[in-house]
C-alpha cells in the first residue's frame, strides 16, 4: 500500500478542530508582482514580506513596493510601508539581515537616474523604526555585515569603490577603487581584489589580492596574477595564473594570506574553473573542471592544511561555472554528502559519501519501491535524488533534499529507483538514518519542511492548479493526514518556516486570482495544539548513528568516533520544543584504514579499503612545494582523515623531509609582499 | 494617450469561427485588464470574457465558456477574442475595453478606454 | 453570477431636469459599481466608477452612490448631450451589466 495508508497508522485526534483554530490567513492588497520573505533575528517571531510590483509605462518600468512587517511568526501582518516612506525598495538586493540577533535591517532604494547616490532604509529594532540615508554612492551589491561586528558594513559601488561604514551605515567612507570582489574574513578583516588597467572583466587573472584588517586605515597586497579568490572554513584560497600559459592554480592560505602554498590539484585551463563545493576548520571539497565542455570534473579532498588533496570521486556532475552542482551536505548526519556523477553513457546517477568523502556509494533501493524503466536489472537498482541540476533542467522538482542539523539523520529527497536519474514524474523519499536506509514517503512532488526538530514534517503537493490541502507526519514520514486549510484554494508559491526547523509554525504562501483582483496571500498554521504535550525522558530512544553492523565492535565507527543520539521514537506525539538540543554521546574508536585517505600519488580503487600508487607516479619522488619550500614526503600512501579522532590500532608511516631547497609557485612569496597605510 | 483599435468588420456563416484583434497604441497593457463586451442589435451591453495581458489569464463569462477563447501578445499590446461555432444571434457589435484592476497599484477605474468596435455579422 | 437589475428601463425627461436611475445587485457588490453613458453607434463612456468616483473629464452634474447592493446615478440637470442610454456594471468577481436605462426627451 502507499505510504501514510496502512492499517496501523494511527491518526491524530481531532486535529482539525485544533488546526482550524491555528490557521491565521492574511490578504494582502496588492498586486500579484514578486513577494520576499526574510526572518530578523531567531526565536524573536519577526518576519519581514516585502512585495514588489512593476508598472510598465511606455518609456520605462516603474516600480511600487510595500512592506509588511509580522511579530508572531506569520499570523498577523503591519503595512509598514510608511516607515520607509512609501519608497520602491529594489528587490535584487533584497533585505539585508544582520547577523545573529542584531535585529539590523538594510533595505537599498531605488532612486531617481540622476541622484549623486543610493539610499537605504536601516533598523537596528527588528523593523520597528526605520531610519532613511542617503548614500555618496550607488550600490552595485547588497550591503554585507561583517560576521563579528554588524556594526560594519561594505559594499561596492557601480563604479567599483570598496565603500565601508563603522556605523551601521550611518557614514561610509571609500577605502579602495578599481574593486572587483570583496568579502569578510575572520576578526573584521576584508579581502579584496583590484584591477590595474582597464576593468576586472579585462584584468582577470592579473588582479591583485589585498588584505586590510583595520577596515581600511592599511592594507596589505597578498598575491599577484589572481584570477578569483575563496574563503572556506579557515582556509583562504587563490586561484593564480601561471606564468607562461593560460593555465591557473589553486594557492591557499591558512594565516589570512601571509603565507601561501601551491594546492596539489591539477592545473586548469581558460575553460575549466574550480569550485569549493564544502569546507569547515578541517578540511575542503574541491571540485576540478575536467577540459572541454564536459559538464563534469573531480571532487579532491584537502588534508588539514589543505594542501595535499586525494581524489574522492571522478566524473562529478558540474556544469559550467556558476552552474549547477547536486552536491549536498547532509546536515542531520556527520560526514554524510550526496551528490551526482555523469556515467560514461551520459546517464545521472546520485552517490553518497557517509565518511567525508573517503568513499562513494550508490543509495540503497527503498524496500517499498519498484526498480524504473531505467534499470536493466529490475531486482538491482538504486535511489536516485533530484537536487539542483534537475531542477535547473525544469524537471517536476520543486525542492532539494532537505535536512537539518537538529532533527537527527532526516533526509528528505525527490527521486526515482532505477539505474539513473529519471526524467518521468518524481516521489518524494525519506531516510531517518543518514541516507543508508530509504523509503517512500510520498507519491508524486511535492513540497516539504521540517517543523519542531523533526517532530512534524509538513508537505504540500506541488500541482500547477490552485489548492487547499496540507499534509502533516508525526511520525518521520511513515503516516499523513490531510488538513484542508482554506476553503477556496489558491495558487501555492511556497513554504515558509523559521530557520532553524525550531518553530511548529509553518506559512503558506500563495495568491488568488480573479478577473480583477490578485492578492497574495498568507496561511499560517501552528501546531502546537497537535502536539499537546513536552516530551518526556521515555518519549525518547538511544540510537547509534552510521550503524550497519551491530555485531561488529566497530560498528558506527566514522571518522575515528561513533556517536549515539538521544532520537524521539516514531510512536511519540509531543513537542520537543524550541530550546530542544541534540544529546550525543561520542566515544572514541582504534584507528582502521578507513581512517585514512589516501596520500597524494596514492589512490583508492573502488570496494577496496587499501590506497595504492597512482600509475603515473609510480617510481618517481613525491615532492611538492610548501610555504616556498620544496618538501619530499615518504608515504606508504595513507594519511589520517581531517577530523578523524581514532587513536591505536592501524598506524601508517607518514614521514615528511624538508628538501631545504627554494621552490617558489609564480605567487608573491612572504618577503616580497609589501604593505601600504593609508 | 492609449487607444484601442481593432479590426474591422467580419461577415461569417453559421457555424464558422471569428478572431477580433485589439491593438493599444500610445501605450503598453501592462497590467491592466482587457474586456470584450458585446453588443447586440438593439439590446444592452453583455461581458463575454476578458484577459490580463501580463499574467497571460483568462476569464470568460458562464454563457461564452468553451466557446470564446481570448489571447493576449504582450509584445505587439494586442488582444484577440476569437468566437467559435457562430450563430446567428452571435450577430453583434463586438468591443474590447481597458480596465483596471481592483487591488494593490492599480487602482479601480471601470472600463476607461474602449475599442471603436467590430462589426460581426453571421448570416447563412 | 451577480445579477444587476436596472430602473426604470426608459425615462423621459426634459432639459435641467434632475434625474435618477437606480441600479440593484442581487448580492453585496461593496462599491465595486461603474455607471457608463452610451449614445447610439457609439462605444460606452465611462462616467462614474468604484461607485462615486468622477472620471476625468466628466462634467459634475453626474455622480454617484450607494453601496452593498443599491446604487443611483443622478444628473442633477439634465442637458441636451446627456440623452443617451446609461448602464451600470458591477465588478466584484466577473463582470456583468444592469439591462439599461434610457434618457429620452419628454
Known amino acids: 500500500s502507499a505510504p501514510g495508508e496502512d492499517e496501523e497508522c494511527g491518526r491524530v485526534r481531532d486535529f482539525v478542530a485544533k488546526l482550524a483554530n491555528n490557521t491565521h490567513q492574511h490578504v494582502f492588497d496588492d498586486l500579484r508582482g514578486s513577494v520576499s520573505l526574510s526572518w530578523v533575528g531567531d526565536s524573536t517571531g519577526v518576519i519581514l514580506v516585502l512585495t514588489t510590483f512593476h508598472v510598465p509605462l511606455v518609456i520605462m518600468t516603474f516600480g511600487q513596493s510595500k512592506l509588511y512587517r509580522s511579530e508572531d511568526y506569520g499570523k498577523n501582518f503591519k503595512d509598514i510601508t510608511d516607515l520607509i516612506n512609501n519608497t520602491f525598495i529594489r528587490t535584487e538586493f533584497g533585505m539585508a539581515i544582520g547577523p545573529e540577533n542584531s535585529g539590523k535591517v538594510v533595505l537599498t532604494a531605488e532612486v531617481s537616474g540622476g541622484s549623486r547616490g543610493g539610499r537605504i532604509f536601516r533598523s537596528s529594532d527588528f523593523a520597528k523604526n526605520f531610519v532613511q540615508t542617503d548614500l555618496p554612492f550607488h550600490p552595485l551589491t547588497q550591503m554585507m555585515y561583517s560576521p563579528q561586528n554588524s556594526d560594519y558594513l561594505l559594499a561596492l559601488s557601480t563604479e567599483n569603490g570598496l565603500w565601508v561604514s563603522k556605523n551601521f551605515g550611518g557614514k561610509w567612507e571609500e577605502i579602495h577603487k578599481a574593486v572587483c570582489l570583496a568579502k569578510w574574513g575572520s576578526d573584521n578583516t576584508i579581502f579584496f581584489t583590484t584591477y590595474a588597467n582597464g576593468s576586472c572583466k579585462a584584468d582577470l587573472g592579473a588582479l591583485e589580492l589585498w588584505r586590510t584588517s583595520d577596515l581600511g586605515k592599511s592594507f596589505k597586497t597578498i598575491g599577484v596574477k589572481i584570477y578569483s579568490f575563496g574563503l572556506g572554513g579557515r582556509f583562504l584560497f587563490a586561484s593564480v595564473m601561471a606564468d607562461k600559459d593560460t593555465t591557473r592554480r589553486i594557492h591557499v592560505s591558512t594565516d589570512q594570506g601571509d603565507t601561501w602554498s601551491m594546492a596539489q590539484l591539477p592545473s586548469v585551463g581558460q575553460e575549466q574553473f574550480y569550485s569549493i563545493l564544502a569546507a569547515n576548520d578541517d578540511m575542503v571539497f574541491m571540485h576540478v573542471d575536467e577540459p572541454g565542455d564536459t559538464g563534469f570534473g573531480t571532487i579532491f579532498t584537502s588534508d588539514d592544511r589543505g594542501i595535499v588533496y586525494s581524489k574522492s570521486l571522478d566524473r562529478h556532475l558540474y556544469t559550467t561555472t556558476g552552474g549547477e552542482t547536486d552536491f549536498t551536505n547532509v546536515t542531520s548526519l556527520r560526514g554524510v554528502y550526496i551528490t551526482s556523477v555523469l556515467s560514461e553513457d551520459n546517464s545521472i546517477q546520485t552517490m553518497i559519501t557517509f565518511d567525508q568523502g573517503g568513499r562513494w556509494t550508490h543509495l540503497r533501493k527503498p524496500e517499498n519501491s519498484e526498480c524504473d524503466a531505467t534499470a536493466k536489472n529490475k531486482n538491482e537498482c538504486s535511489l536516485h535524488i533530484h537536487a539542483s541540476y534537475s531542477i535547473s533542467q525544469k524537471l517536476n522538482v520543486p525542492m532539494a533534499p532537505l535536512s537539518e542539523p537538529n532533527a537527527v539523520g532526516i533526509v528528505i529527497a525527490h527521486g526515482s529507483v532505477g539505474d539513473a536519474i529519471s526524467v518521468m514524474v518524481p516521489d518524494v523519499y525519506i531516510s531517518d538514518d543518514g541516507g543508508y536506509s530509504w523509503t517512500k514517503m510520498l507519491e508524486g512532488p511535492h513540497y516539504y519542511t521540517i517543523l519542531d526538530s523533526g517532530g512534524i514534517i509538513v508537505a504540500i503537493e506541488h500541482s500547477s492548479r490552485p489548492i487547499n490541502v496540507i499534509k502533516f507526519s508525526t511520525d518521520e514520514g511513515q503516516c499523513w493526514q490531510t488538513y484542508t486549510f482554506t476553503r477556496d484554494p489558491i495558487y501555492f508559491t511556497g513554504l515558509a518556516s523559521e530557520p532553524g526547523a525550531r518553530s511548529m509554525n509553518i506559512s503558506i504562501w500563495g495568491f488568488t486570482e480573479s478577473f480583477l483582483t490578485s492578492q497574495w496571500v498568507s496561511y499560517t498554521i501552528d501546531f502546537k495544539d497537535i502536539l499537546e504535550r513536552n516530551c518526556e525522558e521515555k518519549d525518547y530512544t538511544i540510537w547509534l548513528a552510521h550503524s550497519t553492523d551491530p555485531e561488529d565492535y566497530e560498528d558506527g565507527c566514522i571518522l575515528g568516533y561513533k556517536e549515539q543520539f538521544l532520537r524521539l521514537r516514531k510512536s511519540s506525539v509531543c513537542q520537543n520544543g524550541r530550546d530542544y538540543v541534540v544529546t550525543k554521546q561520542p566515544s572514541i574508536c582504534l584507528c582502521s584504514l578507513e581512517d585514512f585517505l589516501c596520500d597524494f600519488g596514492y589512490y583508492r580503487p573502488e570496494n577496496d579499503s587499501k590506497c595504492v600508487e597512482q600509475p603515473e607516479l609510480k617510481g618517481h619522488d613525491l615532492e611538492f612545494c610548501l610555504y616556498g619550500r620544496e618538501e619530499h614526503l615518504t608515504t606508504n600512501g595513507y594519511r589520517k582523515i581531517p577530523g578523524d579522532k581514532c587513536q591505536g590500532g592501524v598506524n601508517p608511516v607518514r614521514e615528511v623531509k624538508d628538501l631545504k631547497k627554494k621552490c617558489t609557485s609564480n605567487f608573491l612569496s612572504p618577503e616580497k609582499q609589501n604593505s601600504k597605510s593609508n | 494617450q492609449v487607444q484601442l483599435v481593432q479590426s474591422g468588420a467580419e461577415v461569417k456563416k453559421p457555424g464558422a469561427s471569428v478572431k477580433v484583434s485589439c491593438k493599444a497604441s500610445?501605450?503598453?497593457?501592462?497590467?491592466?485588464?482587457i474586456s470584450w463586451v458585446r453588443q447586440a442589435p438593439g439590446q444592452g451591453l453583455e461581458w463575454m470574457g476578458g484577459?490580463?495581458?501580463?499574467?497571460?489569464?483568462?476569464w470568460y463569462a458562464q454563457k461564452f465558456q468553451g466557446r470564446v477563447t481570448i489571447t493576449a501578445d504582450e509584445s505587439t499590446s494586442t488582444a484577440y477574442m476569437e468566437l467559435s461555432s457562430l450563430r446567428s444571434e452571435d450577430t453583434a457589435v463586438y468591443y474590447c475595453?481597458?480596465?483596471?484592476?481592483?487591488?494593490?497599484?492599480?487602482?479601480?477605474?471601470?472600463?476607461?478606454?474602449w475599442g471603436q468596435g467590430t462589426t460581426v455579422t453571421v448570416s447563412s | 453570477d451577480i445579477q444587476m437589475t436596472q430602473s426604470p428601463s426608459t425615462l423621459s425627461a426634459s432639459v435641467g431636469d434632475r434625474v435618477t436611475i437606480t441600479c440593484r445587485a442581487s448580492?453585496?457588490?461593496?462599491?465595486?459599481l461603474a455607471w457608463y453613458q452610451q449614445k447610439p453607434g457609439k462605444a460606452p463612456k465611462l462616467l462614474i466608477y468604484?461607485?462615486?468616483s468622477l472620471e476625468s473629464g466628466v462634467p459634475s452634474r453626474f455622480s454617484g452612490s450607494g453601496s452593498g447592493t443599491e446604487f443611483t446615478l443622478t444628473i442633477s440637470s439634465l442637458q441636451p448631450d446627456d440623452f443617451a442610454t446609461y448602464y451600470c456594471?458591477?465588478?466584484?468577481?466577473?463582470?456583468?451589466f444592469g439591462g439599461g436605462t434610457k434618457v429620452e426627451i419628454k
Open positions: 448580492q453585496s457588490i461593496s462599491s465595486w
Open positions: 468604484k461607485a462615486s
Open positions: 475595453a481597458r480596465q483596471g484592476r481592483k487591488t494593490g497599484y492599480y487602482y479601480y477605474y471601470g472600463m476607461d478606454v
Open positions: 456594471q458591477q465588478a466584484d468577481g466577473h463582470i456583468t
Open positions: 500610445g501605450g503598453t497593457f501592462g497590467s491592466y485588464a
Open positions: 484577459i490580463i495581458p501580463a499574467f497571460g489569464t483568462a
